[in-house]
């Protein structure tokens, strides 16, 4: 999937745009908002009725090298008594993010943008029930 | 930056870390995924902490459309289909990387940007404190 070109209806390409070889784009990987600290709610993953654990995946040829993935702890959801209720389902919630992949071909190196699907957490859902004949 | 293992036979001039600026192929690797969460699942309706999805569009960003979740209720939906306010619907937030056109309006020049998105909601049992 290609990154869409800027539509002429909305933009005129400024003269100041850097020259870029055909079929590629210039990417500055100095991240905007890199140091922005977000105040996430504490312990949501433990207090949720569909609790989850986190696993850090690490890949030295990916930028960023660390990607955190969530896994639902249970198939069912935790009820008011703290017991698992398997009439409900814990399901993963997913979000796409971009990473830069570094590829080695012999002694040359190329860079590729890649979409990665990250599991962010879990939610408790009412299952859709089908009775099979 | 991060350290990259190198082929030992290659010249030593290569930087071990990711360079600050790279030339990247215009094609994005990894399937034409469906980025509209309304089409990919109906969890947003079936969850005990249901949410609405709001379209956030910015032509200076890739992807230009991002869907933001807003929890429908303060509490969670109980077995009777009523809102139970002793529980909380809480947004699950995630930092993601997007591309920002830099300089603005340029078709093939971008910078990575980190943004915080609410992806969905989960039902939480709060710890209760009685304030003296």
């Amino acid at each position: 999937r290609k990154i869409p070109k800027v539509g002429h209806t909305f933009f005129q390409k400024p003269e100041s745009c850097p020259p870029v070889p055909g079929g590629s784009m210039k990417l500055d990987i100095g991240i905007i908002n890199e140091n922005q600290r977000v105040s996430m709610s504490r312990n949501i993953e433990s207090r949720s009725t569909s609790p989850w654990n986190y696993t850090v995946t690490w890949d030295p040829n990916r930028y960023p090298s660390e990607v955190v993935q969530a896994q639902c702890r249970n198939l069912g959801c935790i009820n008011a008594q703290g017991k698992e209720d398997i009439s409900m389902n814990s399901v993963p919630i997913q979000q796409e993010t971009l990473v830069v992949r570094r590829k080695h071909q012999g002694c040359s190196v190329s860079f590729q943008l890649e979409k990665v699907l990250v599991t962010v957490g879990c939610t408790c859902v009412t299952p859709v029930i089908h009775h099979v004949q | 930056g991060i350290t990259i293992p190198r082929n030992p036979g290659c010249p030593n001039s290569e930087d071990k870390n990711f360079p600050r600026t790279v030339m990247v192929n215009l094609n994005i690797h990894n399937r034409n995924t469906n980025t509209n969460p309304k089409r990919s699942s109906d969890y947003y309706n079936r969850s005990t902490s249901p949410w609405n999805l709001h379209r956030n569009e910015d032509p200076e960003r890739y992807p230009s459309v991002i869907w933001e979740a807003k929890c429908r209720h303060l509490g969670c939906i109980n077995a009777d289909g009523n809102v139970d306010y002793h529980m909380n619907s809480v947004p699950i937030q995630q930092e993601i990387l997007v591309l920002r056109r830099e300089p603005p309006h340029c078709p093939n020049s971008f910078r990575l940007e980190k943004i915080l998105v609410s992806v969905g909601c989960t039902c939480v049992t709060p710890i209760v404190h009685h304030v003296a």
Epitope: R42, I44 | L74, N88, V90, P126, I127, V128
Partner: nanobody
Framework: EVQLVESGGGSVQPGGSLRLSCAAS????????FGWFRQTPGKEREFVAG????????EYANSVKGRFTISRDNSKNTVDLQMDSLRPEDTAVYYC?????????WGQGTLVTVSS
């Protein structure tokens, strides 16, 4: 430690109005929502109204919809409940609730009496 100070309770005749206020202080950051529950003797505490901190989204119990209005002041960490067209059945102890997603703080309560 979080402190909650409730004020504005009292006695009023049916059809009258009262305004309850609740101020939060201490480590009241990352607020999810702020609101009010009420309780009458021998009954469970019931939700009255709440306001989400991030976007001022409001929710009301059916029994008070159209009569009560909840509002907030972000800069002061306060929430107000304007109660109009009060009825005898609104008589209760009203509790301020500060919700931080995984932790919830309850105030000590303020008595509202509606009678002629």
């Amino acid at each position: 430690e979080v402190q909650l100070v409730e004020s504005g309770g009292g006695s009023v005749q049916p059809g009258g109005s009262l305004r309850l206020s609740c101020a939060a202080s201490g480590r009241a950051n990352s607020i999810n929502w702020f609101g009010w529950f009420r309780q009458t003797p021998g009954k469970e505490r019931e939700f009255v109204a709440g306001i989400r901190w991030s976007d001022a989204y409001t929710e009301y119990a059916n029994s008070v919809k159209g009569r009560f209005t909840i509002s907030r002041d972000n800069s002061k960490n306060t929430v107000d409940l304007q109660m109009d067209s009060l009825r005898p059945e609104d008589t209760a102890v009203y509790y301020c609730v500060l919700d931080l997603s995984t932790v919830r703080y309850w105030g000590q309560g303020t008595l509202v009496t509606v009678s002629s």
